[in-house]
């Protein structure tokens, strides 16, 4: 029986050009975490294997950094990064637990301010 629950950072927002940490935490189970996959829609961002460490998918290597912990850091954010992110915990013997985070990337306030008050 799967007793665990995943806590996530929930709905979060960040500024364009900035970075954000995606975090999930599995609790209420004694199951062994063998691997955590980080995903966005049908894309695999990264895998953290308990024995082998981190693998960042080549498409994201320049913008994704492992950690802290089992979390994932997204860098140089663009508005196209807005959307759902999933942490998939592969555990033994429980099976798979999934957490969801919604990220909204906003135009930076500096950019907005600059656009409104341009000097002619």
């Amino acid at each position: 029986m799967m007793t665990g629950t995943i806590e996530t950072t929930g709905n979060i927002s960040a500024e364009k050009g900035g970075s954000i940490i995606l975090q999930c935490h599995l609790s209420s189970t004694t199951a062994q975490v063998t691997q955590v996959n980080w995903e966005q829609q049908d894309q695999l961002l990264a895998i953290c294997n308990a024995d082998l460490g981190w693998h960042i998918s080549p498409s994201f290597k320049d913008r994704v950094a492992p950690g802290p912990g089992l979390g994932l850091t997204l860098q140089s954010l663009t508005v196209n990064d807005t959307g759902e992110y999933f942490c998939i915990y592969h555990t033994y013997p429980d099976g798979t637990y999934t957490g969801r985070i919604f990220l909204e990337v906003l135009e930076s306030s500096v950019a907005e301010h600059g656009a409104r008050f341009q000097i002619p």
């Epitope: 996959n37 049908d42 894309q43 024995d51 981190w54």
Partner: antibody, heavy 120, light 107 residues
Framework: EVQLQESGPGLAKPSQTLSLACSVT????????WNWIRKFPGNKLEYMGY???????YYNPSLKSRISITRDTSKNQFYLQLNSVTTEDTATYYC??????????????WGQGTSVTVSS | DIVMTQSHTFMSTSVGDRVSITCKAS??????VAWYQQKPGQSPKLMIY???YRYTGVPDRFTGSGSGTDFTFTISSVQAEDLAVYYC?????????FGGGAKLEIQ
């Protein structure tokens, strides 16, 4: 360049223990992941398990009760032990390296393979 | 376990032809797929990882595509030396599993 070489008996009797060794040159087994994969007659490949850079092991659950992977870092060798073999274990056994950080679970270096027949 | 199905176990082609080998995963594996080439009497060689990335030294006539459950390995212009068995593999989760292989015959 990384080179792997399997060695061990080509013939085993049912119920015996199969022991194979893999000698690695050009790279230290204290980095990356060191794996055993077998190919059955008729081409089917089966992933058997690994020993990691730190000495942690993973075994395919289909073999878990029969398999052991160990290493000797002073000799830069790792080993496969498969207990209670049957004719179904007749296969070509490959040792292989996996660079998880760069390629995930894709195996980038393979030994040439050693053929094992289980027969009474 | 995730099952990787290569429905065409045998494919016949001619030098210069374009050939595609398909692989279907029993569940969504995103892009965690590799392709290998095994020539007669040799060990497998890594060709593609992360569904579409060519491994070091692999000629650009070999390409990989797909995500989710459906994957394709394409040789744009088959050469005589491409005679081999081609395998897909998923590494989305352990145990990592392979397809049954597709044998490419050159006419």
């Amino acid at each position: 360049e990384v080179q792997l070489q399997e060695s061990g008996p080509g013939l085993a009797k049912p119920s015996q223990t199969l022991s194979l060794a893999c000698s690695v040159t050009g790279y230290s087994i204290t980095s990356d992941s060191w794996n055993w994969i077998r190919k059955f007659p008729g081409n089917k490949l089966e992933y058997m398990g690994y020993i990691s850079y730190s000495g942690n092991t993973y075994y395919n659950p289909s073999l878990k009760s029969r398999i052991s992977i160990t290493r000797d870092t002073s000799k830069n060798q790792f080993y496969l032990q498969l207990n209670s073999v049957t004719t179904e274990d007749t296969a070509t056994y490959y040792c292989a390296r996996l660079d998880f950080s760069n390629y995930g679970g894709a195996v980038d270096y393979w030994g040439q393979g050693t053929s094992v027949t289980v027969s009474s | 376990d995730i099952v990787m199905t290569q429905s065409h176990t045998f494919m016949s082609t001619s030098v210069g032809d374009r050939v595609s080998i398909t692989c279907k995963a029993s569940q969504n594996v995103r892009t965690a797929v590799a392709w290998y080439q095994q020539k007669p009497g040799q060990s497998p060689k890594l060709m593609i990882y992360s569904a579409s990335y060519r491994y070091t030294g692999v000629p650009d006539r070999f390409t990989g595509s797909g995500s989710g459950t459906d994957f394709t390995f394409t040789i744009s212009s088959v050469q005589a030396e491409d005679l081999a068995v081609y395998y897909c593999q998923q590494y989305y989760t352990t145990p990592w599993t392979f397809g049954g292989g597709a044998k490419l015959e050159i006419q």
